[in-house]
């Protein structure tokens, strides 16, 4: 609350943040021709990566092309990417919404069609649908723990939102335990009107505002954090400007003196740490 | 504009990136002793990385170190670094400049020169001039959407970068486009009155600044954002200050059961996106 | 110092930092049963990582989980997770402490404990303490150039933490040489009243808090950055609320076409960069 | 499914040739050839982009052995001089992606190199 006659100072805020859970995935995946059924475990080591400060991601979802090579090959048939003849095809014109550069050969991609070739990561990463339901779903159940320190240097006040008193096994509830700064991913979407499972399926950011209204003085002392939660990406956003929040990344390796990669397209939930408020004094 | 009636707050922000382009890169290859002319093509996976909320990251130059072993070798002979006999080399020191820990004897580093022996990642990496032109310099033509969501919590007030109204194919022009918000990166470099050919070899930071001025009153409303460019890093820097932007990450296999690895000096564009502002109310 | 006829300004504020050192770690190497010591070096491609902004991570310690398959295998008896009977084990459950999730048997664990047999990474991770000293403890002789560039749009004034007049060879000293931006990394501690050997074990956040204080009017001008030093994670904290600073990461690889990972335990200091202050002018 | 028939498989000595042809059901952008040896693992030999764009050979058998397409008939060809009795195996027709990843494989070709 405004207290005209308070010296107001902002917060200087650190944040660290600590995600727990495994995933059970279950996926085709294909072998010498054969497809079946794979079973893996996904823990924080496969699912997470070591990000600074303000923000942790968490996988969701993914789509792998693997033994890739660096050679040519016919490019994705996407639409409008088709050819019947060279004509078509541009030498060293590179397509924004693809993934190498043209040779300026049109050439079989399959019994059917015919598409440009390009110099590129090879067999070109095919533009499919993200798996649904996503395949890290269960990551709703996952919890991440919170830690957060704030410092008014103008008033020499630090406090942080972690007391000696509090229970390192509960789960935070608005009601319940408002305090309580391990935090319930699935909860974190339901507090902000959000559905994890269909969120998870693209990808999304999420926000975890954490406001700090502080009044340091000594006689009416108050500074205690309030959490809130809003998701901060556009989940009407047009296919152009690249809806959800996902990544490519790539695991490089060699085999038989050959340099190739496994390319991920992974999706998932960036959550942001959005950490506000004043201390205000007399 | 300063409204003295109005409540100011300032703004809670966050930022989603993503990059697109593909280039194309000629370099000397040598396999088997023998030197020839490789190509190679480098796309999202390959010249960028995950990176969280108001930075990102454009390889457009590297050094590469193959095939380091831990083990004993010459240090590279760098000016002040050769010796002539065992008492130039002082067994457990290191260097700052050197990249191991030297064992007290002075070897021959080739046919004309010695140094001081040392522990380390060898051969130890060479310190050679960052190729010029740029590996990566066609990243110029590259592209990054920036989505910058916005929040005034005292005046519960959000919005966003990138309105429904918005056509995905646009290009941010200050004059013609001013409110797209996808940029390609040469013309941020231009409007900052900088030459990205030049800053690519030895990377730098470059600045993206989203300026929210927001009038939050109904009769007078206004809250869109205004985007401005400058260099952060200090191009006249000392050597002795690391000027540019470079960092080592390295690739570990193994070979022959033997632990080895990849050193990675890259250099690039390291892009801060700093978003300020204010909404002021009634 | 308040001038309260000032327009004062809140700083915008960029980063770089860049870490220099060479650790040499002596740990236990177990290959084909025999147990020897092993000398390795650790440069900063090997621990740090390429990271944005106002952060950076220097790994100090570290617990490795080598050559981990994705199979069943018991799970590592913890104090609680010894079973005697099936019955202990539920199909499907996933205990937020565990590795893995449940198939529903009690198996042997060694000759005299068991415990449930879980879907995995295996074998799963020794839960064994940080080793002591740690590892990398020279890291306190480490040093880090921090670059700082600030922003006051509003005064249209901008400058940087490291003038042309500065020596590249430089250590930061609170007294002999305040405005040095190379810091020893052991020098931060002390200044923070923190012991560095100590705190390598199970790692920490450390903050390095710039303050500019900026005085833009022409007659009275001064805009110079004071460096402090204080530690931002709890070192009294709870087991349960995690202490420390840690993280894994993987490394995966193939083995006669077996999908395989060295998981890393990594311990280190997080070094947060908090820039604040104001430019104030007539 | 791509249906491959090899032929030109048979007994020959050391130092002789051999032309293999392979003709596939439909029209692919790469025809290459493997073979597997007894008692060792299928290994790649020669492969052929479209129009004989790009080709790649297996290091033992670069200088010796020649690719070649015929893109409208849908055939691909191995031409071995210089032959050795370690070139003793089946040898497999295949098609595929790009040069270096292939999808369909024939039943295979017994070649045998007497010393």
């Known amino acids: 609350s405004d207290k005209l006659y308070q010296r107001k100072e902002p917060v200087i805020s650190s944040v660290h943040t600590k995600v727990k859970g495994i995933a059970e995935v279950t996926e085709n995946v294909t072998e010498g021709g054969v497809t079946k059924l794979g079973h893996s475990i996904f823990d924080t080591a496969d699912y997470t990566f070591p990000l600074q400060g303000n923000s942790f991601f968490v996988m969701t979802n993914y789509v792998k092309s693997e033994g890739q090579v660096q050679t040519l090959c016919p490019e994705y048939p996407r639409r409008g990417a088709q050819c019947s003849s060279d004509r078509r095809c541009k030498k060293g014109w590179m397509d924004p919404q693809s993934k190498g550069i043209q040779t300026g050969r049109c050439v079989p991609y399959d019994k059917t069609r015919k598409t440009c070739e390009v110099s590129a990561w090879c067999p070109t990463e095919e533009e499919k649908e993200a798996p649904r339901p996503a395949l890290l779903r269960s990551a709703e159940n996952f919890t991440v723990l919170i830690k957060n320190n704030i410092h008014f240097p103008g008033h020499n006040y630090t406090t942080r939102n972690i007391l000696p008193t509090m229970n390192g096994s509960c789960t935070f509830h608005k009601t319940w335990d408002p305090q309580c700064s391990i935090f319930r991913l699935g909860d974190i979407f339901q507090e902000a009107g959000e559905n994890f499972t269909e969120v998870a399926v693209q990808g999304g950011i999420m926000g975890i505002e954490i406001y700090w209204d502080c009044n340091l003085d000594s006689w009416s002392h108050h500074c205690r954090p309030r959490y809130s939660f809003r998701r901060l990406d556009d989940k009407n956003m047009d296919e152009s400007f690249v809806p959800g929040y996902n990544f490519r990344y790539a695991k490089y390796y060699k085999e038989n003196n050959v340099e190739k990669r496994t390319l991920i397209k992974a999706f998932g939930i960036r959550f942001d740490i959005l950490v506000f408020g004043t201390g205000g004094k007399f | 504009s300063d409204k003295l009636y109005q409540r100011k707050e300032p703004v809670i922000s966050s930022v989603h990136t993503k990059v697109k382009g593909i280039a194309e890169v000629t370099e000397n290859v040598t396999e088997g002793g023998v030197t020839k002319l490789g190509h190679s093509i480098f796309d999202t996976a390959d010249y960028t990385f995950p990176l969280q909320g108001n930075s990102f990251f454009v390889m457009t130059n590297y050094v590469k170190s193959e095939g380091q072993v831990q083990t004993l070798c010459p240090e590279y002979p760098r000016r002040g670094a050769q010796c002539s006999s065992d008492r130039r080399c002082k067994k457990g020191w290191m260097d700052p400049q050197s990249k191991g820990i030297q064992t007290g004897r002075c070897v021959p580093y080739d046919k004309t020169r010695k140094t001081c022996e040392v522990s380390a990642w060898c051969p130890t990496e060479e310190e050679k001039e960052a190729p010029r032109p740029a590996l990566l310099r066609s990243a110029e033509n590259f592209t990054v959407l920036i989505k910058n969501n916005i929040h005034f919590p005292g005046h519960n007030y959000t919005t966003r970068n990138i309105l429904p109204t918005m056509n995905g194919s646009c290009t941010f022009h200050k004059t013609w486009d001013p409110q797209c918000s996808i940029f390609r990166l040469g013309d941020i470099f231009q409007e900052a009155g900088e030459n990205f050919t030049e800053v690519a070899v030895q990377g730098g930071i470059m600045g993206i600044e989203i300026y929210w001025d927001c009038n939050l009153d109904s009769w007078s409303h206004h809250c869109r954002p205004r985007y401005s460019f400058r260099r952060l890093d200090d191009k006249n820097m000392d050597e002795s200050f690391v000027p540019g932007y470079n960092f080592r990450y390295a690739k570990y296999y193994k070979e022959n059961n033997v632990e080895k690895r990849t050193l990675i000096k890259a250099f690039g564009i390291r892009f801060d996106i700093l978003v300020f502002g204010t909404g002021g109310k009634f | 110092s308040d001038k309260l006829y000032q327009r004062k300004e809140p700083v915008i504020s960029s980063v770089h930092t860049k870490v220099k050192g060479i650790a040499e770690v002596t740990e236990n190497v177990t290959e084909g049963g025999v147990t020897k010591l092993g000398h390795s070096i650790f440069d900063t491609a090997d621990y740090t990582f390429p990271l944005q902004g106002n952060s950076f991570f220097v790994m100090t310690n570290y617990v490795k989980s080598e050559g981990q398959v994705q199979t069943l295998c018991p799970e590592y008896p913890r104090r609680g997770a010894q079973c005697s009977s099936d019955r202990r084990c539920k199909k499907g459950w996933m205990d937020p402490q565990s590795k893995g999730i449940q198939t529903g048997r009690c198996v042997p664990y060694d000759k005299t404990r068991k415990t449930c047999e879980v879907s995995a990474w295996c074998p799963t991770e020794e839960e064994k303490e940080a080793p002591r000293p740690a590892l990398l403890r020279s890291a306190e002789n480490f040093t880090v150039l921090i670059k700082n560039n600030i922003h006051f749009p509003g005064h249209n004034y901008t400058t940087r933490n490291i003038l042309p007049t500065m020596n590249g060879s430089c250590t930061f000293h609170k007294t002999w040489d305040p405005q040095c931006s190379i810091f020893r990394l052991g020098d931060i501690f002390q200044e923070a009243g923190e012991n560095f050997t100590e705190v390598a074990v199970q790692g920490g956040i450390m903050g390095i808090e710039i303050y500019w204080d900026c005085n833009l009017d022409s007659w009275s001008h001064h805009c110079r950055p004071r460096y402090s030093f204080r530690r931002l994670d709890d070192k009294n904290m709870d087991e349960s609320f995690v202490p420390g600073y840690n993280f894994r990461y993987a490394k995966y690889y193939k083995e006669n076409n077996v999908e395989k990972r060295t998981l890393i335990k990594a311990f280190g200091i997080r070094f947060d960069i908090l820039v604040f202050g104001t430019g104030g002018k007539f | 499914e791509v249906q491959l028939v090899e032929s030109g498989g048979g007994l020959v000595q050391a130092g002789g040739s051999l032309r293999l042809s392979c003709a596939a059901s439909e029209r692919t952008y790469s025809m290459g050839w493997f073979r597997r040896a007894p008692g060792k693992e299928r290994e790649f030999v020669a492969g052929s982009g479209w129009d004989g764009i790009p080709t790649r050979y297996a290091d033992s058998v670069k200088g010796r052995f020649t690719i070649s397409r015929d893109n409208a008939k849908n055939t691909v060809s191995l031409q071995m001089s210089g032959l050795k009795p370690e070139d003793t195996a089946i040898y497999y027709c295949?098609?595929?992606?790009?040069?270096?990843?292939?999808?369909?494989w024939g039943q295979g070709t017994q070649v045998t190199v007497s010393s």
């Open positions: 295949a098609t595929g992606t790009s040069v270096y990843h292939y999808q369909y």
